[in-house]
């Protein structure tokens, strides 16, 4: 049941009014208007589209829209100077090179400005030399060359396939391994579903689709040049050469046909095993070099790509709050794409925009949401998360005083098969209370819950009879509220069966062919999909901006450090003899946990039972709910990582995109046989365990009883 | 969509040699490979060989080593066999057909074929 | 070189009816990236080869489902459920695992 009351302004709207009023019909039309011309950061017609939401969302009744601006690198293509790459023979003469772009879709051919394949941020460069095939370029990978295979990839040119885990990851592996350049490329056992045609005829990646994307590795800072602080008209910007997380190395994706040109030449080592074998029908030889008959040939890569401060725009909606103006929940997804944006961003997108007409609606009947709701279309996603960023640093004080949550709306859809949540474990209960209101859109389960067959096709590991939700880790504008700030956040959309197709993200991911027709033809031509995360995401909103008791449960919280806890715990133990040799002991951090524990079933006792009338004592119990997320954060961050400050949660040090419970103990335990000084490595792992003891604790006490 | 056109039927003498041609149309030439196939009357289907339009590569069946050269130009988008100190065994008609790439990788679109007639 | 066995040469049918085709490899069609490129085509008089089955068992677009391929290592079968007029000729199986080969042929008549 909606634990919503309404506000003494208007009583008939609640969440049913809010909800009945989302439209698939309208999301539909949104995503086609969003849809028709690229809409690149830095881009005129992204600025434009950002001036059309503004207008929009002022039609639509909210109470402000501004726009804010910041100046922030960008990375783009040299028009009259493509990126390629080339076999080159013994003389030097190119005898083949990669395709300069990606055939267009039909319908698509007399589009202008669709920025051909390229890695945002590489450097420029023309390295050669012999290829080594790493696989995923993962940390494991690398292990595996280096340690068992003795492969030195020093002075090679690396080609990886994409998937698994964040591009960034691959790039700074590669880096550290000594590579000079690094090829990437769509593997079609990671993006070709089986019995699926390729696009326009399927939603698999054809053979000269190419997947574009950054490298960088911010680790939450943020625009390169003005790492903690808004890139506005009066910031200090660093040199080019003390910039956050830019590649070393000159990097470029390519589609599988070019793959297959590279990869079949390629001799030296076999593959160790199966798990490094694609689809394509070549040897998968780890190198160096190519075989025989072509061991005189080598790979010469042609980046010319420039890095330039540019010009980006936020959309920041506001409607205020009736009775707690000053406490803001959030709806933010970014507007910019890499092209069309089929489905990301602009699926998300078209979500968002309806969401904000359901609620301008409600609101132009003369209801107001109790806590003030800020909608916000980011700018720059695609280049490291920066106009999120650039926004949270520039409001900072504001947010960590007022921000209740905050919820992400990036693509609405990576399949079509069920939902998927990542979120605090201070919003399950939300989740779980609002999909059982909420109607399924999956076929065979007419007439039943969200829940229902969310539980059926992705169950919890853990709990029967529940569904999965995940940890937050990165790679979304949720980032910089929830790993830097300390705000609660979620997200949720619908995906794919991870049982049956094992290729990571959608095969059209980021590239031309993510357009209208791929939604509408192969994805959710009824818009059903759309519909049922517009219902997730705006009831999500409209519970945490409108319950008079914020809708968190701290004692969730407990449930997950108690196994966050065993799992560090048990990864220690993999080193019991060390243990014994350095004392280490998880003891304290178990103590903590136990207390917490108590601490937060004491403080939802006195939740349940306080006088929700007594306004003085409802605003105290709220904040302590709010602050929770907040008790979390360790000013001095993590290390080597100042903008991850989050203790109980980051995004892993070896995939961005995946969330690390105790980041700071498993970073310091992570191949710590290998250390050089064993004595300072396990004392570092001490220093961890009582960081995070402190933080637990702490957070723990911020539920006890106020005096 | 695509194409693959053969020149026309040849009448050649014992000993001398002939050059056919295949012009590509509908598909990007350099990411599929080209290959030449031999059906003799009444017989089954023997693979000459297969050139690569991106780099020039070529793979030749050992039977048919010093008998035919595959060639591509690019430019055109044509490939082209030479057969050379022609003998009656070779009266036949010669195919190319293009190596389908992922998921195929089998020959998925063939010429009509040319007929070669080796006579005095 | 791989050789393909065809079994058997000649298929007199009833349109109508199923037909079924062989081919025998002399060793595995498996590839190191765990597919394997066993191919059918057909061949009508006067035509050049179309390809119909690739990868043992996916139809080529186009391909009417009343064609089928099945089996794997060295065994393998092509099924027409309901043969139709315009199925007659002469099929070919195909590896491309290996320097490409072709079978025999089975020449697929009105009985």
């Known amino acids: 049941k909606s634990s919503s009351e309404a506000t003494n302004i208007t009583p008939k709207h609640n969440m049913k009014a809010f909800l009945d009023e989302l439209k698939a019909e309208n999301i539909k039309k949104f995503l086609h208007n969003f849809t028709q011309i690229p809409h690149l950061a830095g881009t005129e017609q992204n600025f434009q589209l950002a001036k059309q939401i503004q207008s929009q969302w002022k039609e639509f009744g909210l109470d402000s829209v501004e726009l804010t601006h910041y100046d922030v690198l960008l990375s783009y293509p040299n028009k009259t100077h493509p990126n390629y790459i080339s076999i080159i023979n013994e003389d030097g003469n190119e005898i083949f090179n990669t395709s300069l772009f990606e055939p267009p879709p039909a319908g698509y051919e007399n589009v202008s400005d669709i920025v051909p394949p390229f890695s945002a941020f590489s450097p420029q460069g023309m390295p050669e030399g012999d290829l080594v095939y790493v696989n995923y370029a993962r940390t494991e990978d690398f292990f595996k060359l280096e340690r068992d295979m003795k492969i030195n990839c020093s002075g090679k040119i690396v080609i990886a396939r994409y998937g698994k885990v964040f591009r960034g990851n691959k790039v700074k592996n590669a880096q550290l391994a000594g590579a000079t350049g690094v090829i990437l490329y769509s593997d079609p056992a990671d993006y070709f579903a089986p019995g699926v045609k390729s696009y326009p005829d399927g939603w698999n990646l054809p053979g000269g689709g190419v997947q574009r994307g950054n490298i960088l590795n911010l680790n939450g800072a943020g625009d390169p040049l003005t790492p903690g602080y808004p890139a506005n008209e009066y910031a200090y910007r660093r040199g080019m050469a003390e910039a956050v997380g830019l590649p070393s190395i000159p990097v470029h994706p390519i589609g599988y046909y070019d793959a297959q040109k590279l990869l079949e030449k390629m001799g030296g080592s076999a593959s160790p095993d199966s798990s490094w074998r694609g689809s394509l029908k070549v040897p998968y030889n780890v190198g160096p070099g190519f075989t025989g008959n072509f061991s005189t040939q080598k790979v010469k890569m042609h980046i010319h790509s420039t890095s330039e401060v540019t010009r980006i725009y936020n959309v920041i909606g506001t409607l205020r709050g009736a009775v707690e103006p000053d406490r803001y929940v959030i709806l933010g997804g970014h507007r910019d794409s890499w092209v069309f944006g089929g489905i990301d961003p602009q699926s998300g997108a078209a979500v968002v925009h309806e969401i904000v007409r359901s609620f301008g609606t409600l609101k132009k009947e003369g209801w107001r949401p109790r806590r003030t709701i800020l909608f916000a279309s980011w700018d720059a996603e695609e280049f490291g998360l920066l106009g999120s960023t650039e926004w949270a640093e520039e409001n900072s004080r504001l947010l960590q005083e007022r921000g209740v949550a905050y919820i992400n709306a990036d693509s609405s859809i990576e399949g079509n098969y069920t939902l998927r949540v990542d979120c605090t474990p201070l919003m399950y209960s939300l989740v779980y209370n609002l999909t059982k209101e909420l109607e399924s859109p999956d076929e065979g389960f007419e007439g039943k819950s969200l829940y229902e067959s969310w539980t059926k096709k992705s169950p919890s590991p853990e709990f029967s009879g529940m569904p999965r939700i995940s940890k937050l880790g990165s790679g979304n504008d949720f980032e910089v509220f929830f790993q830097r700030l300390g705000i609660a956040s979620g997200r949720a959309r619908y995906t794919k069966n991870w049982e049956t197709n094992k290729f990571s993200s959608y095969p059209l991911y980021h590239s031309v062919y993510e357009t209208y027709e791929l939604v509408e033809k192969f994805y959710d031509p009824m818009f059903k999909y759309h519909l049922t995360v517009a219902q997730v995401r705006g009831g999500m909103v409209f519970e945490l901006a409108n319950s008079v008791v914020l809708p968190f449960d701290c004692r969730d919280y407990a449930v997950v450090l108690r196994k966050y806890a065993d799992k560090i715990y048990n990864i220690s133990m993999k080193h019991p003899q060390e243990m014994k040799t350095y004392s280490v002991s998880f003891d304290s951090l178990f103590s903590a946990v136990k207390n917490f524990t108590e601490i937060a079933s004491k403080f939802s006792e006195r939740l349940r039972d306080f006088d929700k009338s007594n306004p003085i004592l409802l605003r105290m119990m709220n904040d302590q709910l709010m602050f929770l997320e907040r008790a979390f954060i360790d000013p001095l961050g993590l290390p080597d990582r100042p903008f991850y400050r989050h203790v109980i949660y980051a995004p892993s040090s070896h995939n961005k995109y995946a969330g690390e419970s105790f980041p700071g103990i498993y970073d310091a335990l992570f191949d710590i046989e290998s250390k050089v000084d064993p004595s300072q490595a396990w004392g570092e792992v001490k220093r961890q365990i009582s960081v995070a003891t402190f933080t637990v604790q702490a957070a723990a006490e911020t539920l006890s009883e106020v005096a | 969509q695509v194409q693959l056109q053969q020149s026309g039927a040849e009448l050649v003498e014992p000993g001398a040699s002939v050059k056919l041609s295949c012009k590509a149309s509908?598909?990007?030439?350099?990411?599929?490979?080209i290959n030449w196939l031999r059906q003799r009357p009444e017989q089954g289907l023997e693979w000459i060989g297969g050139?690569?339009?991106?780099?020039?590569?070529?793979n030749y069946n050992e039977n048919f080593k010093g008998k035919a050269t595959l060639t591509i130009d690019k430019s055109s988008t044509t490939a082209y066999i030479q057969l050379s100190r022609l003998t009656s065994e070779d009266s036949a008609v010669y195919f190319c057909?293009?190596?389908?790439?992922?998921?195929?990788?089998?020959?998925?679109?063939w010429g009509q074929g040319t007929s070669v007639t080796v006579s005095s | 070189d791989i050789e393909l066995t065809q079994s058997p040469l000649s298929l007199p049918v009833i349109l109508g009816d199923q037909a079924s085709i062989s081919c025998r490899s002399s060793?595995?069609?498996?590839?190191?990236?765990?597919?394997?490129?066993l191919h059918w085509f057909l061949q009508k008089p006067g035509q050049s080869p179309k390809l119909l089955i690739y990868?043992?068992?996916n139809r080529f677009s186009g391909v009417p489902d009343r064609f089928s391929g099945s089996g794997s290592g060295t065994d393998f079968t092509l099924k027409i459920s309901r043969v139709e007029a315009e199925d007659l000729g002469v099929y070919f199986c195909?590896?491309?695992?290996?320097?490409?080969?072709f079978g025999g042929g089975t020449k697929l008549e009105i009985k």
């Open positions: 990868t043992v068992s």
């Open positions: 050139i690569s339009p991106g780099d020039g590569n070529t």
């Open positions: 060793q595995s069609l498996v590839h190191s990236n765990g597919n394997t490129y």
């Open positions: 057909a293009r190596d389908g790439n992922f998921p195929y990788y089998a020959m998925d679109s």
């Open positions: 509908g598909y990007t030439f350099t990411y599929f490979d």
């Open positions: 195909s590896q491309s695992t290996h320097v490409p080969t």
